[in-house]
């Protein structure tokens, strides 16, 4: 059965998935999809990485951790009730039927209180990034600017936003971790 994670409407949700690269920079392709893991790849893909980089990415879904070190945990920005459901993290370890599949269940709760109107931070503006999709389908490039310097205030704010949907250490214990090599 799927491990369950919770977040409130308007929060960022955090779905953990980790692997240990055999050597630094020796990355394994990973996909995230909405829906349980099918036979190959992920269904309704929201994000992919290849051996080098994130190569497919849809709005509101991003990797906040250091994916080059195997932290491929998914952050879903500003969740709504429609984001509830099962998500698949698939670590595509080369070889014969070597893929590791993790189904994670996200439960979105209504917000406890309606906050006073405040200026909502534009995450795309705060964290623009360059994304080039290559291979694996029709060529498509989206340039969203380069990654800026992130200051401690931003990191602290992010940490607060993520706290409710589980701490990283708890998540590592949930089983969505695989060691390679």
């Amino acid at each position: 059965s799927e491990v369950e994670y919770r977040a409130e409407v308007g929060q960022n949700a955090y779905l953990p998935c980790f692997y240990t690269p055999a050597a630094p920079g020796n990355l394994v392709p990973v996909c995230w999809g909405k829906g349980a893991c099918p036979v190959f790849e992920c269904g309704n893909v929201v994000l992919r990485t290849d051996e080098r980089d994130v190569n497919y990415w849809t709005s509101r879904y991003w990797l906040n951790g250091d994916f080059r070190k195997g932290d491929v945990s998914l952050t879903i920005e500003n969740v709504t009730l429609a984001d509830s459901g099962i998500y698949c993290c698939r670590i595509q370890i080369p070889g014969i039927m070597n893929d590791e599949k993790f189904n994670l269940k996200l439960v979105i709760k209504p917000a406890k209180v309606t906050p006073a109107p405040t200026r909502q931070r534009d995450f795309t503006a705060a964290f623009p990034r360059m994304l080039t999709t290559r291979g694996h389908g029709p060529a498509e490039t989206q340039t969203l600017g380069s990654l800026p310097d992130i200051n401690l205030t931003q990191i602290s704010t992010l940490a607060n936003e993520l706290r409710d949907s589980r701490l990283a250490n708890d998540l590592r214990d949930s089983g969505a971790t695989i060691r390679i090599g």
């Epitope: 829906g35 036979v39 790849e41 893909v45 595509q92 370890i93 014969i96 029709p138």
Partner: antibody, heavy 123, light 107 residues
Framework: EVKLVESEGGLVQPGSSMKLSCTAS????????MTWVRQVPEKGLEWVAS????????YYLDSLKSRFIISRDNAKNILYLQMSSLKSEDTATYYC????????????????WGQGTTLTVSS | DIQMTQSPASLSASVGETVTITCRAS??????LTWYQQKQGKSPQLLVY???TLAEGVPSRFSGSGSGTQFSLRINSLQPEDFGNYYC?????????FGAGTKLELK
């Protein structure tokens, strides 16, 4: 136009080996998962093996993985199925098929199929 | 392995009729189900994927439905070119498995 053309099959002896090939054209071969499916005459379809875009990940029907090897040559746009220790129950029409794909989908169903090649294993 | 049970095994119908073919999975496969049509001596053709999405170029008289373990393919107003064999395939569990097929014949 997407085309998948399998090599000639034929009659082979039990215990022997055979390598099938499937030449692809009309699409960017290296962007797609590829699959072999077989069909015994007048019977249903049976998945045999699949391979990912760059050939680093392969998937097999459990009962065949010790005897069959799927591979691909993206430079030549060719999919292969190397079969060894052939048995009479391997007699079938073998189809190569392309995994349906677009960004955001998974290649778990097959949108183009070859015409099929018939392999008969008999003494 | 996930078993796919198709029914009926064969079906006779006339042009203009509506027919329904069903497929049952031995366990929950969510919406990971595909339908193919295969005519005599030809390769299979993709009809419906993800239980209900019509493949490109497939006439709208075909429709798929269901999720979990129960699925169906409905063909409204049968046309002469619709006769042949129909197969369901699940793509949730390894190995990929197909139903045994339904033979749709002209009455």
């Amino acid at each position: 136009e997407v085309k998948l053309v399998e090599s000639e099959g034929g009659l082979v002896q039990p215990g022997s080996s055979m390598k099938l090939s499937c030449t692809a054209s009309g699409f960017t071969f290296s962007d797609y998962y590829m699959t072999w499916v077989r069909q015994v005459p007048e019977k249903g379809l049976e998945w045999v093996a699949s391979i990912n875009y760059d050939g680093r990940n392969t998937y097999y029907l459990d009962s065949l993985k010790s005897r069959f090897i799927i591979s691909r040559d993206n430079a030549k746009n060719i999919l292969y199925l190397q079969m060894s220790s052939l048995k009479s129950e391997d007699t079938a029409t073998y189809y190569c098929a392309r995994g349906y794909y677009y960004y955001g989908s998974s290649p778990n169903y097959f949108d183009y199929w070859g015409q099929g090649t018939t392999l008969t294993v008999s003494s | 392995d996930i078993q796919m049970t198709q029914s009926p095994a064969s079906l006779s119908a006339s042009v203009g009729e509506t027919v329904t073919i069903t497929c049952r999975a031995s366990e929950n496969i969510y919406s990971y189900l595909t339908w193919y049509q295969q005519k005599q001596g030809k390769s299979p053709q993709l009809l419906v994927y993800n239980a209900k999405t019509l493949a490109e170029g497939v006439p709208s008289r075909f429709s798929g439905s269901g999720s979990g373990t129960q699925f169906s393919l409905r063909i409204n107003s049968l046309q002469p070119e619709d006769f042949g064999n129909y197969y369901c395939q699940q793509h949730y569990g390894t190995p990929l498995t197909f139903g045994a097929g339904t033979k749709l014949e002209l009455k």
